[in-house]
Interface confidence: low
């Protein structure tokens, strides 16, 4: 028969858990023998593992509540495809049975003693009540018994004797008007109001009492606005220092509107809350040097040599700058006064040479004269010889970058009867005048 | 094989409704158990509820009482009914199948389909 199978069998509770699914026999169920089976929903959860005792079951209630009686507890043959032992099948039930005492012994009942005397009345006018008590002692109940009936009773008492009537205020009487129109001045405003004893008056045979506690209340006015007030200037405060360690610089002084501050509409202090003054350190400020630009490379050469132009030997060349403006103690100049590289002269050589593409058209010129023209050129253009782009010149020091210096002579084709630049030219159309851009402003 | 198509999922507010279905295709005969897992950002995938052949229910914890699962075997076709839809309920949601031979089982996967539930 197909039976429900489950991928866990909780030992403790003896439940299957994780469905897997149903309509699979027991034999596929239990290829996996960590799995368990349930032949209907809510029926008993089987392992699948070899059968074996399941954990006793927690004992039973005791089967009497009070002195000593019995309870039972059992453990079941669980598992699959065989037995517990000899001649016990699956499913087979084992009890244990013990003594068992929830409570060493059984409630009994109490007697009643006789009924004391009655208490006064409890009232010492017109009608009241009054009680009278028993005990729950003859004999005492045992084991967390009680007595039947209730402990104590009363009944209805009559003193004979007329009550007198006691004084009662009656309503508060509506509020006075309010004695000012604003709180926080020199009086605070108050209302007033008064209640009688009228409700009702208190008896004179048999005498009553006076109404308790005041005829008249008074009370602080609510929602009235605060009294406006005045704000009034703080002295001036000390000097600030002065803000700077070289040329003029501006101190100040604060005071503020705090005697008192300005509250609930009250005007504040008139005049200004800070007041400044020119301070002089007499101190020029330092000016930081700034660098010029670089000057102009120095011929390309290489010591003991006189000269190395047109020649694949490379040489060296330098250029200065200098620091200009430095005053009155300002920073120098950071970085080097002098620039070194490496350099191949080219200088009056003569190249091979290919001319160059048109140029971009140049500016009109000139840009406020008559007829401004521009112009572009092709250029003889010359082709550097392939020498080596970078050289070791020391040991250790690592390749460093040559580069060709000088003016060399290119030879190229001649080009419209040109050897080194072919111009054209035109005229710019449509020119506007040249004006003062402020005087277009008037 | 087995193919599986999910419907029904979109965005709803916090408190609506929405239906998911899935129908199955292809050698169905063999399935024994189909399933709803879910699929948030940044997080495993979990399952929502399942449904054995005979109709055994099983609920995660944080949608029982909401969600409902149920099969039509004539139409081939497992659906999850979710009321009372909570922002957390935003995923991914996956439908499965479970098929179960005597040389062993296989699982399959539907594409997804995104359920947003607003705020």
């Known amino acids: 028969d197909p039976v429900l199978c489950f991928t866990q069998y909780e030992e403790s509770s003896g439940k299957c858990k994780g469905l897997l699914g149903g309509g699979v026999s027991v034999k596929d169920c239990c290829l996996n023998t960590a799995y368990a089976y349930q032949e209907r929903n809510g029926g008993l959860c089987q392992p699948c593992r070899s059968p074996r005792w399941s954990l006793w079951s927690t004992w039973a209630p005791c089967s009497v509540t009070c002195s000593e009686g019995s309870q039972l507890r059992y453990r079941r043959c669980v598992g699959w495809n065989g037995q517990c032992s000899e001649r016990v099948a699956l499913g087979t039930l084992e009890w244990q049975l013990q003594a068992c005492e929830d409570k060493q012994c059984c409630p009994e009942m109490g007697g009643w003693s006789d009924w004391g005397p009655w208490e006064p009345c409890s009232v010492t006018c017109s009608k009241g009540m009054r009680t009278r008590r028993r005990a729950c002692d003859h004999p005492a109940p045992k084991c967390g018994g009680h007595c039947p009936g209730e402990a104590q009773e009363s009944e209805a008492c009559d003193t004979q004797q007329v009550c007198p009537t006691h004084g009662a205020w009656a309503a508060w009487g509506p509020w006075s008007p309010c004695s000012g129109s604003c709180h926080g001045g020199p009086h605070e405003p108050k209302e007033t109001r008064s209640r009688t004893c009228s409700a009702p008056e208190p008896s004179q045979k048999p005498p009553g009492k006076p109404c308790p506690g005041p005829a008249y209340e008074h009370r602080k006015c609510t929602g009235l606005p605060p009294c406006p007030v005045a704000g009034g200037w703080g002295p001036w405060g000390p000097v600030s220092p002065c803000p700077v360690t070289c040329g003029l610089g501006q101190t100040i002084e604060r005071r503020t509107c705090n005697r008192p501050v300005p509250q609930h509409g009250g005007p504040s202090c008139a005049g200004d809350a800070t007041r400044t003054h020119i301070c002089n350190t007499a101190v020029p400020c330092p000016v930081d040097g700034e660098w010029d630009l670089w000057g102009q490379w120095s011929t390309c050469v290489r010591r003991n040599m006189k000269s190395i132009s047109c020649e694949e030997i490379p040489g060296q060349q330098s250029r200065w700058r200098t620091c200009k403006g430095r005053k009155f103690d300002g920073h120098r100049c950071t970085g080097q006064q002098q620039d070194i590289r490496h350099c191949y002269s080219i200088q009056h050589c003569p190249l091979k040479g290919s001319w160059s593409e048109w140029s971009t058209w140049g500016l009109c010129m000139p840009p406020c004269g008559p007829n401004p023209t521009r112009a572009r050129q092709r250029l003889c253009t010359p082709l550097l010889p392939k020498y080596p782009p970078t050289v070791s010149m020391v040991e250790g020091q690592g390749e460093k970058n040559v580069t060709f210096w000088g003016r060399p002579l290119p030879r190229c084709e001649e080009l419209q009867g040109q050897k080194l630049v072919v111009e054209e030219k035109r005229p710019c159309l449509h020119v506007p005048a040249c004006k003062d851009p402020e005087e277009e402003k008037l | 094989q087995v193919q599986l198509v999910e419907s029904g999922g979109g965005l709803v507010q916090a408190g609506g409704s929405l239906r998911l279905s899935c129908a199955a295709s292809g050698r169905i005969s063999s399935i024994i158990h189909m399933a709803w897992y879910r699929q948030a950002p940044g997080k495993q995938r979990e399952l929502v509820a399942e449904?054995?052949?005979?109709?055994?229910?099983v609920y995660a914890d944080s949608v029982k009482g909401r969600f409902t699962i149920s099969r039509d075997d004539a139409k081939n076709t497992v659906t999850l009914q979710m009321n009372s839809l909570k922002p957390e309920d935003t995923a991914v949601y996956y439908c499965?199948?479970?098929?179960?031979?005597?040389?062993?089982?296989?699982?399959?996967w539907g594409q997804g389909t995104q359920v947003t539930v607003s705020g």
């Open positions: 499965n199948a479970l098929q179960y031979e005597k040389h062993g089982g296989a699982d399959y």
């Open positions: 449904i054995s052949r005979v109709g055994t229910t």
